[in-house]
Each structure stands twice: as C-alpha cells, then as structure tokens.
C-alpha cells in the first residue's frame, strides 16, 4: 500500500514541476544548490535557480524536449559544475565534476560542510528589515531560505519552506505594527531556536540513514510512530514506516523535489487514513499543506488502547519463539518493537532501541542453546538496568539543574565534558556543553512519564552535533569510538567517559585569558559564551581543578567583568584588572 | 466498522473437502494472528490453529494433517482447508482475532460463525 | 499440550447471588489465562485476560484472579443477563492454545 506514485514520467523535472508548483520549485532548487555549494554568492545562485526553472518550464510544455528525460541529479550536477570558481572556492569538490552519476551526486554529498566558514548572521535593525521587506519581497525571502540552507546544509527542506511561510508572515504582521521591533523580534528568536532545534533533528535522521544504514533509521522510526500512534495496528506503522524513510532518504541524499513531494503525498495519505492512525490528528488534516506536514510531525501521542495483553506471553513464555524468531526475524522484531513502544511512551526511543537490541541478541544466543526456553525465560529481567540507568541519570541531572539553574548547570557540563574529551576543539565544547545544559530548562519540568522521551531523545541530538562537527576534525579517539560504535548508545557511551588521565594539560596562555572593553556591550548570552570559553579553557590547563577551584575562578571573572564594565575607563581597567585576575587565577589553581 | 465474517459453509458428505473463508473489514490481516475455532452442537469451544504475522501456522495436535491454515493479505482474507472430513466435523467455525501478531490470545475480535455439516 | 478443567460443568444460581467459577490448568500457565461468556447462537465475548485485567466495556462485577495453575472468575451479584456458558482459555505458553470445558449458569 505505497502511497508513492510508482508510474514512470518522461521527464522528472517536469513531472516534479507541475506537482510542486513553480513557487516550490524554485524555493526547493535554491535549497539543494545552497546546501551543495555553501560559499557561493547569493546572485550566483539564484542565476542557477533561474535558468533550472526556465529548463523545466520547456520540459512542461513538452516532455519530449531535448534534455527533458535526464535525470534530476543529472541537471542539477551539471548546472553545479557550470560555476566558474568552482576550484578556488571549493577546492577538491571541483573534482566531483569529472565523475558520472551517481558518483557526481554521492561526492558533493560528501564535501557538504556542517561547519562552514561563513560570518555569523547578524540580524539588522527592524526599520532596515522592513524596507528590504517592503522593497522586494520575492528577493527578501529567498535570501532567508539561501542563509539558512548554506548554513545547515541538512535542513530538511520542506520544512524550510514552512520556516519561510512564517518568516515572511511575521513580517506582514509586524512591518505594519506600531511597535515594529517589539512584534518582530520575539517571532525571529523563535524562528532562530526552533531552526537551530529543526536543523539538529534532522542532522541525527540523515546520520542515522548515512552511518547506520536504512535498518538502523526504520527501527528509530517503529519505535517513534508506535509511541505516536498505539492505536494504529502494525500494519499500518510498518506502511507509513516505509514511506518516512523513502522521505528522509530523499531529503538526506539531496533529492529535495522527490523528498518534498512524497512527504506531501504522506501527510495526503495520513490524514485520508486519520481513523485508522491516530485520533490526534483532526486539527493538523485541516490546517493547509506546510502547517499540516509539520504538525503531523510534532502530533502528541495518541492514547494507548485498552485491552493491551502482557507481551511475556508472545515473547518470553512461549515456547516458540525460536521458531517464530527463525522463520520471520524481521516481523518477529518488529513485532515486539512495535508492542514494546506503543506500551511505553514514558520510555525515549533510543532506549526501546536498546532493549529491543538486547532481546535479538538474547534470541541469537539462547535459540542456539541446549534449551532455549530455560536461556530466554528472563530475558525482560535484563531489561531492568537498561531502563534504570537513563531514569536515574535524568533524575539526578534534574535536580542539579534545579539546584544550580541553566547557566551553572551548561557549567557544570562544560567542565564534566572538558574532562572527558579535552582535545575537543573549545568551540565545539562550549557549543555542545551549552546545549546539552538546555536540556534542564526543555525537560525537567515535565513530569516523569515524559521526562525520558524529552531528555534522552533531546540528547542523542545534541550528541549527533558533536559526532558531526568530530568527524570533520577528529581529535578524539574516545569520541570517535562513542559516535561510532552504537548509534542508540552513544549517550550512555559519554555517560561513561571518566576523566582522560592521558591527556597532556595545554599550556598556558594569558592570551586566552585577557579581556577587553567590548564584552561590555555583548548581549548577556554572548557574554556567557565568552565566560564559558574562558571556563574550557581553564580546565585544559588544569584537567584535575576541583570544582571549588574552578567555582572561585569563575567568580572572580565574574565580578571582574561587572567591575570594568561599571569602570569609567573601561579598557584601562580590563588591561589592570586583568594581569592581576591571570595571576591570581594561576595561584589559585597551581599553574 | 472492525469485523470479521466467514463464508464457505455448508453441507458436505463425509470424506469430502470444504474451504472455510474468514474476510476481515475495518483493519489488516497481516498484523494479527488469525484463528479458527470450532463448537459441535451442544458442545464447548475447540481451537483449530492459527497462522501468525509471520505466516507461520500451528494446529492443535488432532488437527494436523487434516486442516490447513492460510491467508491472502491482498484480499484481506485468512482461509481453513479441510479434507477427510468426518461428522463428527459437524460444527460452527469461528473466525478469531489474536491480541497481536504472535499471540495466541486472548481473542477479543469474532466472527459470527458459518455451519457445516457433514453427512451422507 | 496443557489442559484446562473447568469446574462446575453447570452451576445454577439467582439473581444478586455471588458466583464462582474455577479452571485449574495442567502445567503452570503463568497468568495467561482468559475467560469467555458466550449466549446462544453468538460467538464467545472477552471478559478477562492476563488472569485478571477486565476487558473495556466489560461491567467491574466480572473479576477475575490466580496465576500458575488455579484461577478463579467471580460475578459479584448475579444479573439477569449473565445466564450464559463461560469458558477459560489458556494461552502463551506455546503457539497453541486450550479452552475450559465450559461452564452453564442457569437461573436457579
């Protein structure tokens, strides 16, 4: 029961043309060429975009048009390698352009940066925004999409293009307001964390298809959708398990058109078939194409069913469970991933991964044995650590997040994180400590029951940030080994990092440690930023600092920078105050 | 609407073959272990067999060689073929939903049953 | 296979009245135990599973207990329309499954 159209077109580009709409068209081709090739000029790209879609205009009207029956990657690749600084701008990737596809495709995925070096985004004043607003709409919003997409080259692009309706909504709104800067900026700070949080989810999707396979993603996706939707039968999870990975894959592999329009044609096929999936979904199937894909994504669970019998019975008492294991492996697991999940939407899903791990090796082993009824029978007692390591590492980080509060809390993980893996670049450390510490302020508030799902699943994203950024330069055998290994257990793989007793402590550099005036007018976040750098660093000199140590640092630092920011010659008093900070600092810690 | 209605009852003389339909509306098939359940007249309930989402058919031990269970998931259908049959075959036969793919029960989903009788 | 006897075979009572019906398994069974009401020309209804969870729909007078080998179900007050044959069905320790011989209630 696919619900993707099988027929075969004449031509791809048009096929995709007349079934996105012109406006789509160009917004997805824009996507795919920004993500492709981070550093080119906007000018540049929007040329391509133009001359792609003029291309499948011609093909419309007729399909049998020179060129028309290529493939899309086929005509995209070859507008991509028309850019005349190809080879002094992206050195290497120029090379993709003598192989043939799909090889062509799989190498400018391989060259897409996670980390590009491009300028920090800065937002201008609210009056310039809405002239540019005002003066070319069309142009205003393609740049949003073309800064956003060269910047997180994983962006799964129809959800783009929903970040886009609201971006450009809130300037219509807000343009017109009478207090323009306080209508707009709160909309553009949620449209900033809810893209950086997008972007992060998506980067673990195609990770997980990338690394780990298609098996590894459709697993992730049973246990998800069951949670979602307990009452919809196997059958149908299974089904629409299917057709998200065609999706994702699509999306994660560039194929942005195709991606686009089959997540379309699902959200078609969900809300078509809402009485048999979820009954949640009434208000999503009513909101228009966009708002509909992206509420289904984020639809709460539905209510477990009544009458849910004790798996034990399937799945550990009988005695044919070998049988029904070696005669339908992938239908038996799927099976008993889909019964576990539905019945445990308090448990995240990396962790029904992992127990649903433990039963399929338990099953390897104990269908081989003498008597593999007497191996299996306490096969759910192993379940009990699994379940409780996560639930007693939330609920301790719980508490320290209470106690210590958001920004000491990032704190304390910038340090516990430093110590595991000091040969992190800082940024890197700072970026992932700082998001990692979110976690606090987005899920201890929850109650139990949704404590789990939100924590752990929020921190195999975050994990996934540093594993992505890793992978461009490693540095750290231990996070290679932790990214690696297991997908579902990496956090209980940094969970379990002590201290890297072989790491040489970094020598000291005042540098690092001085400051000047401009802190003074840094947002409170990007002065929190700079404390916390300051606060890697130190712990890279001085791996085996005590906490009390590194507390009484940090509050000197702390009222040092209050101190000089009240000072009338400010700069005078960071250049004084400073020497006498680094040499008590280096007393304090021994250095 | 969620139910199961079986077909393909009926009288037949003894040493002859029937086979028993059991059509599902309102869900699919494939995700259920699908069983068949008999009551002679005046009598208890007998289980038959099932065959699991892994298309795997067990029988109780009286009726294996005799019964066969299979299904067709295009036509939503699962199917009881019988052979040799006897009268003391004589009996309603049911249509049962397993709890899930792999279960053996509870059976909360039933047919309304069809006849057969065997005699000469 | 297992074995399921049901006890009594018939059982006779009033309205109001508390009633009692046992199976007793012949191998332990864990708590994979149902029962069934079945009236007339109908196929069997679900009242109990896993021994003792009440089916949604199901009046709380239906209870149900044991594990292992002795389970019990019990009508707290007796209604009108519980005269019926019920049965207990065995399930989970193997790909086949038992029912109970049955058990008529009949209006004393």
């Known amino acids: 029961r696919g619900v993707f159209r099988r027929d075969a077109h004449k031509s791809e580009v048009a096929h995709r043309f007349k079934d996105l709409g012109e406006e789509n068209f160009k917004a997805l081709v824009l996507i795919a060429f920004a993500q492709y090739l981070q550093q080119c000029p906007f000018e540049d790209h929007v040329k391509l975009v133009n001359e792609v879609t003029e291309f499948a205009k011609t093909c419309v009207a007729d399909e049998s048009a020179e060129n028309c029956d290529k493939s899309l990657h086929t005509l995209f690749g070859d507008k991509l390698c028309t850019v005349a600084t190809l080879r002094e701008t992206y050195g290497e990737m120029a090379d993709c352009c003598a192989k043939q596809e799909p090889e062509r495709n799989e190498c400018f995925l391989q060259h897409k940066d996670d980390n590009p070096n491009l300028p920090r985004l800065v937002r201008p004043e609210v009056d310039v925004m809405c002239t540019a607003f005002h003066d070319n709409e069309e142009t205003f919003l393609k740049k949003y999409l073309y800064e956003i997409a060269r910047r997180h080259p994983y962006f799964y692009a129809p959800e783009l293009l929903f970040f886009a309706k609201r971006y450009k909504a809130a300037f219509t709104e807000c343009c017109q307001a009478a207090d323009k800067a306080a209508c707009l900026l709160p909309k553009l700070d949620e449209l900033r964390d809810e893209g950086k949080a997008s972007s992060a989810k998506q980067r673990l999707k195609c990770a997980s298809l990338q690394k780990f396979g298609e098996r590894a993603f459709k697993a992730w996706a049973v246990a998800r959708l069951s949670q979602r939707f307990p009452k919809a039968e196997f059958a149908e999870v299974s089904k629409l398990v299917t057709d998200l990975t065609k999706v994702h894959t699509e999306c994660c592999h560039g194929d942005l058109l195709e991606c686009a329009d089959d997540r379309a044609d699902l959200a078609k096929y969900i809300c078509e078939n809402q009485d048999s999936i979820s009954s949640k979904l009434k208000e999503c199937c009513e909101k228009p194409l966009l708002e509909k894909s992206h509420c289904i994504a984020e639809v709460e669970n539905d209510e477990m069913p009544a009458d849910l019998p004790s798996l034990a019975a399937d799945f550990v008492e009988s005695k044919d469970v070998c049988k029904n294991y070696a005669e339908a492996k992938d239908v038996f697991l799927g099976m008993f991933l889909y019964e576990y999940a539905r019945r445990h939407p308090d448990y995240s899903v990396v962790l029904l991964l992992r127990l649903a791990k433990t039963y399929e090796t338990t099953l390897e082993k104990c269908c081989a044995a003498a008597d593999p009824h007497e191996c299996y029978a306490k096969v759910f007692d192993e379940f009990k650590p699994l379940v409780e390591e996560p639930q007693n590492l939330i609920k301790q980080n719980c508490e320290l997040f209470e106690q210590l509060g958001e920004y000491k809390f990032q704190n304390a993980l910038l340090v516990r994180y430093t110590k595991k893996v000091p040969q992190v670049s800082t940024p890197t450390l700072v970026e992932v400590s700082r998001n990692l510490g979110k976690v606090g302020s987005k899920c201890c508030k929850h109650p139990e029951a949704k404590r789990m799902p939100c924590a752990e699943d929020y921190l195999s994203v975050v994990l996934n940030q540093l594993c992505v950024l890793h992978e461009k330069t490693p540095v750290s055998d231990r996070v290679t080994k932790c990214c690696t290994e297991s997908l579902v257990n990496r956090r209980p793989c940094f969970s379990a990092l002590e201290v890297d007793e072989t790491y040489v402590p970094k020598e000291f550099n005042a540098e690092t440690f001085t400051f000047h005036a401009d802190i003074c007018t840094l947002s409170e976040k990007e002065r929190q930023i700079k404390k916390q750098t300051a606060l890697v660093e130190l712990v890279k000199h001085k791996p085996k600092a005590t906490k009390e140590q590194l507390k009484a640092v940090m509050d000197d630092f702390a009222a040092f920078v209050e101190k000089c920011c009240k000072a009338d010659d400010k700069e005078t008093c960071f250049a004084e105050e400073g020497k006498k900070l680094v040499a008590a600092s280096q007393a304090a810690l021994g250095l | 609407e969620v139910q199961l209605v079986e077909s393909g009852g009926g009288r037949v003389q003894p040493g002859g073959s029937l086979r028993l339909s059991c059509a599902a509306s309102g869900f699919s098939l494939s995700s259920y272990a699908m069983n068949w359940v008999r009551q002679a007249p005046g009598k208890g309930l007998e289980w038959i067999g099932h065959?699991?989402?892994?298309?795997?058919?067990y029988y109780a031990t009286w009726a294996k060689g005799r019964f066969t269970i299979s299904r067709d998931n295009s036509k939503n259908t699962v199917y009881l073929q019988m052979n040799s049959l006897r009268a003391e075959d004589t009996a309603t036969y049911y249509c049962a939903r397993g709890a899930g793919g792999f279960s053996t029960g509870p059976f909360k989903l039933w047919g309304q049953g069809t006849q057969v009788t065997v005699s000469s | 296979a297992f074995e399921l006897t049901q006890s009594p075979s018939s059982l006779s009572a009033s309205v109001g009245d508390r009633v009692t019906i046992t199976c007793q398994a012949s191998e332990s069974i864990n708590s994979r135990l149902a029962w069934y009401q079945q009236k007339p020309g109908q196929p069997p209804k679900l009242l109990i599973y896993?021994?003792?969870d009440l089916t949604s729909g199901v009046p709380s007078r239906f209870s149900g207990s044991g594990s292992g080998t002795d389970f019990t179900l019990t009508i707290s007050s007796l209604q009108p329309e519980d005269f019926a044959t019920y049965y207990c069905?065995?399930?989970?320790?193997?790909?086949?499954?038992?029912f109970g011989g049955g058990t008529k209630l009949t209006v004393l």
């Open positions: 065959i699991n989402a892994g298309d795997i058919a």
């Open positions: 069905q065995g399930y989970g320790g193997s790909s086949t499954t038992t």
């Open positions: 896993d021994a003792s």
